[in-house]
Interface confidence: medium
Amino acid sequence: TQHGIRLPLRSGLGGAPLGLRLPRETDEEPEEPGRRGSFVEMVDNLRGKSGQGYYVEMTVGSPPQTLNILVDTGSSNFAVGAAPHPFLHRYYQRQLSSTYRDLRKGVYVPYTQGKWEGELGTDLVSIPHGPNVTVRANIAAITESDKFFINGSNWEGILGLAYAEIARPDDSLEPFFDSLVKQTHVPNLFSLQLCGAGFPLNQSEVLASVGGSMIIGGIDHSLYTGSLWYTPIRREWYYEVIIVRVEINGQDLKMDCKEYNYDKSIVDSGTTNLRLPKKVFEAAVKSIKAASSTEKFPDGFWLGEQLVCWQAGTTPWNIFPVISLYLMGEVTNQSFRITILPQQYLRPVEDVATSQDDCYKFAISQSSTGTVMGAVIMEGFYVVFDRARKRIGFAVSACHVHDEFRTAAVEGPFVTLDMEDCGYNIPQTDESTLMT
């Protein structure tokens, strides 16, 4: 799943609020022990930024070797640098681990731009700022890579949190989270709060700053406001969901809702942008351009190739529209919407010499592999990956960037008919979204 770009037919019939309150599961329903409440030891355990990925500290081997690992819900391999590389400060040294076991099998993962390859094995793994457990997990020891590691990103490996179906070399390689749940009493659920800074961070600031939280095995109430709304996981491969309607500043894009999910829609922490299928991207950009027409921006900006800058503190957030994605709800004919601000989809960029300016990249881009709800979306919300109940929850993040006039929102219920028809039935292929 990629960091710059991815470091990868019918109408929803309405979807507009009709004032009809449909029944839904309350946010306060009793659940398994340990699923809710406070997870103090895990709060603030992520660092990084949307453009280069968010990472968590992990240890591998005996004695433990500490590595920073990119949290990626768009892939399913646990893979770590295991050989010297110009962009790595450290790497996994298998020969120093008394608990390493070689699986005598290689793995090769090509992407649209770049690749990694390595050797499969297992070792003991733990997460210092996570649950107090150690598991034996599959590890791909990366011995060769091209355009995979990012200079200055400060992570040395990737934790693929999606399902076995997209694991490489095949679905027999058990992903880390499956191993964790099988070998411990950790509930089959994790949640992510990715915190965009709202301004560019230099290298030392990233190292010193908090990037968010990965709560393993539960939900922490302090990380969100309002209610959690859940959308079904359509199929357990990527974290696939169904979008039933899209609005720009409240204006329906009025597309056949199948287009929004062509050929799938996924939630992917390893992708920077909100990526949209070609037709949807073109319609969305047209609408965003029209809404922000008080200023004329270069075409290269809308293509993500050029930046726009304003004098520090004068970014006219108000001229840019909010974007709402309506997601299928858990109840028949019920949907809810998540709304992001320009503070999420205009990404601050740090490589500009004129430091008295605030410069941004348009972080919505075109995709040929469906909708990817990357960091741009996730930075607005606390996202619960409830694998046990095959659903993903969204609530407004306590750390999202906003202004005094508008805030990100999660709202519902809305009546939306025939939502099942919004899903696209994809031909079976083996693919990964990493770095496409």
């Epitope: 270069p298 075409d299 050029q306 726009v308 800058c309 010499a353 004129t354 410069c359």
Partner: nanobody, 127 residues
């Protein structure tokens, strides 16, 4: 790290020609503006020529119109300033610069448009 390196300066007789080059490297995003500026001894830096990328519009200062031509080679990440019919008043240090879109900058030669500048190359025109 962004670097701009000018070359091609030198001394020439009035009426002569020079071609300045500027190699741009390390720029993460396509620049919106690319420009040539000059600074004569004891004077303010002034814009000579500028191009808006994507739109392709080229702007020239009145004093050089018809004599100077701005061109670029995207494949080589290089911009050029062809200077013909040079005059003694063209004597100056010439700088290339690149920058991003800025809503507040008023003209193509507003130096606030430009993020990165070369070190400059001396052009001397004698009569």
């Amino acid at each position: 790290d962004v670097q701009l390196q000018e070359s091609g300066g030198g001394s020439v007789q009035a009426g002569g020609s020079l071609r300045l080059s500027c190699a741009v490297s390390g720029f993460s995003y396509s620049p919106y503006y690319m420009g040539w500026f000059r600074q004569a001894p004891g004077k303010e830096r002034e814009g000579v020529a500028a191009i808006r990328k994507g739109i392709g519009t080229t702007y020239y200062a009145d004093s050089v119109k018809g004599r100077f031509t701005f061109s670029q080679d995207d494949a080589k990440n290089t911009m050029y300033l062809q200077m013909n019919s040079l005059k003694p008043e063209d004597t100056a240090i010439y700088f290339c610069a690149v920058g991003h879109y800025r809503a507040y900058a008023t003209t193509s030669f507003d130096p606030r448009r430009y993020d990165y500048w070369g070190q400059g190359t001396q052009v001397t025109v004698s009569s």
